[in-house]
């Protein structure tokens, strides 16, 4: 057993070396090890075949180190590995696409708070058993096509707290078992109409705290199992182009957040769901050089990116403007309230179990600009729309073991409390 470690055989053969100031993966780890705990050290590099001798390894925790490099063959030979925790290694920044190849039994992979800027092609290839993938609180800007294609058993995908600006058509291809997709606190301004085509089992979709001004209902159509949807804290434009979303929300039988309007000015702060159909008239247009709010691409039907309902016809040249108002949106779409500028809001009156599950607090938190938050820190500012009644999966036996966020051997993503007790 390596000097800084404790090794024991019952109930599983374990090599445990947490928080020992180790600067490298120790030599002499017993080959029979089923669990290796190396978290909280100063390890900066995982060389090729570091654990090759450990053929029975099922759990490997390397979280909270200072990993800057993981050799592509670092985990070679670990065919039985089920849990791999690499989180809280902010200097990592990139992972060789071959790193996880051969980990056919892996069901939980933590890559949260690793400073990742991109997901290389084929990074998750062959991980057919993967159920939980933690990618939150990184610096990801894009979701390349088919990144998750092989993850047919993935149930939880955590992508919140990144810098993702759009959800392309093939981003989530192959995720037929996905139950929870968390995309909140990003910079998403555009969702492709077919982005969620394979997500027929999705129950929870979080898109709050993004940059969405519109959302094609075609994107929501495949989500037959959807029960929990959060869309708050986005710059929604509640004019004629919001009618399809408004109609979809009226029919939606699950729980959904408020969808507060940013434009037009007369509807600012109002919840789209509570508007009447005839409130959604005309088109709100930003001032200055013509810059349509609509995020779709220009087509024959939508010249300059304007949807059909916003195109002026010969009979009514003013129909592109909000009725009775100048073509000015003020600064409604420019800047979000900086974190902490608004005090946390409170509901009023006693709370009951059957209260509406979502409420909107004033202010709005900018998606994190830093790649990671240190362990133990709160997110920037207050959460902008915290549901009191947060969605959960239906379960009768009240256990975390089959449906909790972050189950199946994972520690879940996110941070600890920073407040003292």
């Amino acid at each position: 057993c390596p000097g800084a470690c404790v090794c024991y055989n019952e109930p599983k053969v374990t090599t445990s070396c947490p928080q020992q100031g180790l600067q490298a993966v120790p030599v002499g780890i017993p080959a029979a090890s089923q669990r290796i705990f190396l978290h909280g050290n100063r390890i900066s590099h995982v060389p090729a075949a570091s654990f090759r001798a450990c053929r029975n390894l099922t759990i490997l925790w390397l979280h909270s180190n200072v990993l800057a490099r993981i050799d592509a063959a670092a985990f070679t030979g670990l065919a039985l590995l089920e849990q791999l925790d690499l989180s809280d290694n902010a200097q990592l920044r990139s992972v060789d696409p071959a790193t996880f190849h051969g980990l056919g039994r892996l069901h939980t992979l933590h890559l949260d708070r690793c400073g990742l800027q991109e997901l290389g092609p084929g990074l998750f290839r062959g991980l057919a058993a993967l159920q939980y993938l933690y990618l939150q609180d990184n610096a990801l800007q894009a979701l390349p096509d088919d990144t998750f294609r092989d993850l047919g058993n993935l149930t939880h995908l955590f992508l919140h707290g990144n810098r993702i600006s759009s959800v392309p058509e093939r981003a989530f291809r192959g995720l037929h078992s996905l139950d929870r997709l968390l995309l909140h606190q990003n910079r998403v301004a555009h969702v492709h109409p077919h982005a969620f085509r394979d997500l027929g089992r999705l129950m929870t979709l979080y898109l709050f705290a993004n940059n969405l001004s519109a959302l094609p209902t075609e994107a929501l159509a495949p989500l037959r199992a959807l029960q929990y949807l959060r869309l708050n804290d986005n710059p929604w434009v509640c004019d004629c182009r919001a009618r399809p979303l408004w109609a979809w929300l009226q029919k939606f039988r699950g729980s959904s957040s408020e969808v507060p309007c940013s434009l037009p000015q007369r509807l600012a702060g109002r919840d789209l769901k509570r508007l009447a159909a005839n409130d959604l008239q005309g088109c709100a247009v930003a001032t200055g050089p013509y810059h349509p709010i609509w995020t779709g691409r220009a087509t024959d039907e939508e010249p300059l990116g304007l949807p059909k309902c916003c195109q002026p016809d010969a009979a009514d040249k003013a129909s592109v403007l909000e009725p009775g108002r100048p073509a000015s949106a003020g600064n409604a779409l420019k800047g979000r309230v900086p974190p902490g500028d608004s005090p946390p809001g409170n509901g009023s009156g006693p709370r009951h179990i059957n209260d509406s599950p979502f409420g909107t607090l004033p202010g709005s938190a900018e998606p994190p600009l830093t790649a990671v938050r240190p362990e133990g820190s709160e997110p920037p500012g207050f959460p902008t729309s915290g549901p009191r009644r947060r969605p959960g999966c239906s379960r009768k036996n009240r256990t975390r073991s089959h449906c909790r966020l972050g189950q199946a051997g994972s520690g879940g993503g996110g941070t600890g409390d920073s407040e003292g007790s």
Epitope: P344, G359, C393, S401, E419
Partner: antibody
């Protein structure tokens, strides 16, 4: 900095009820899961109940079912624990505690990260 | 309910020693375990959650590991202020249950 400030010590007669308050400062109560834990003199910690953010409901330990009621008032950011039909064995320090996990930050861990200082309830005839 | 069993129930060690406290769950709780420290007359203080995550502000001499049914809290280089009672708690399901506690005394 977030704090949980509990109401003061009380002495109660057997059969009576007691209502302990837990005022949250520095964070909106609507964002939190508050749990209640008690500790009899010289004994260990005993979970009584709290808000389960996954199943969207308040849950109670079976031992206290029917005797304890947990409520919140978001207008004052105060959580309450009421225990009825008091008996001498209910003499204990009662703590409120904030669960670490809250979904908006992407934190899925469950553990009691912040505790109130405790409220001593003495049940004596 | 899940039973949590700590051992030893009390331990006495000297400053600078390494102390290990173990906690066993009556069924698999994955890594859903927290450790608390409580000093006389004070509220408990969270040390570790999710079996191995160190709570903010907790000294690095505290570490946790384990998964499934067996877990350990290790205190390296024991300090006088570590004299306290330590509790484990499973956070895998309801009802939340605590171990009976381990009293750590500094010789």
């Amino acid at each position: 900095q977030m704090q949980l400030v509990q109401s003061g010590a009380e002495v109660k007669k057997p059969g009576a009820s007691v209502k302990v308050s837990c005022k949250v400062s520095g964070y909106p109560l609507s964002e939190l899961s508050i749990h209640w834990v008690r500790q009899a003199p010289g004994k260990g910690l005993e979970w009584m109940g709290g808000f389960d953010s996954e199943d969207d409901e308040t849950v109670y330990a079976q031992k206290f079912q029917g005797r304890v009621t947990l409520t919140d008032d978001t207008s004052t950011d105060t959580a309450y624990m009421e225990l009825s039909s008091l008996r001498s064995e209910d003499t204990a320090v009662y703590y409120c505690a904030r669960d670490l996990g809250y979904l908006t930050s992407g934190n899925y861990y469950d553990a009691f990260g912040i505790w109130g200082r405790g409220t001593m309830i003495t049940v004596s005839s | 309910d899940i039973q949590m069993t700590q051992s030893p129930s009390s331990v006495s060690a000297s400053v600078g020693d390494r102390v290990t406290i173990t906690c066993r769950a009556s069924q698999d709780i994955n890594r859903w375990l927290a450790w608390y420290q409580q000093k006389p007359g004070k509220a408990p203080k969270l040390l570790i959650y999710a079996a191995s995550r160190l709570q903010s502000g907790v000294p690095l001499r505290f570490s946790g590991s384990g998964s499934g049914t067996d877990f350990t809290l290790t205190i390296n280089s024991l300090q006088p202020e570590d004299s306290a009672t330590y509790y484990c708690q499973q956070t895998n399901n309801f009802p939340r249950t605590f171990g009976q506690g381990t009293r750590l005394e500094i010789k």
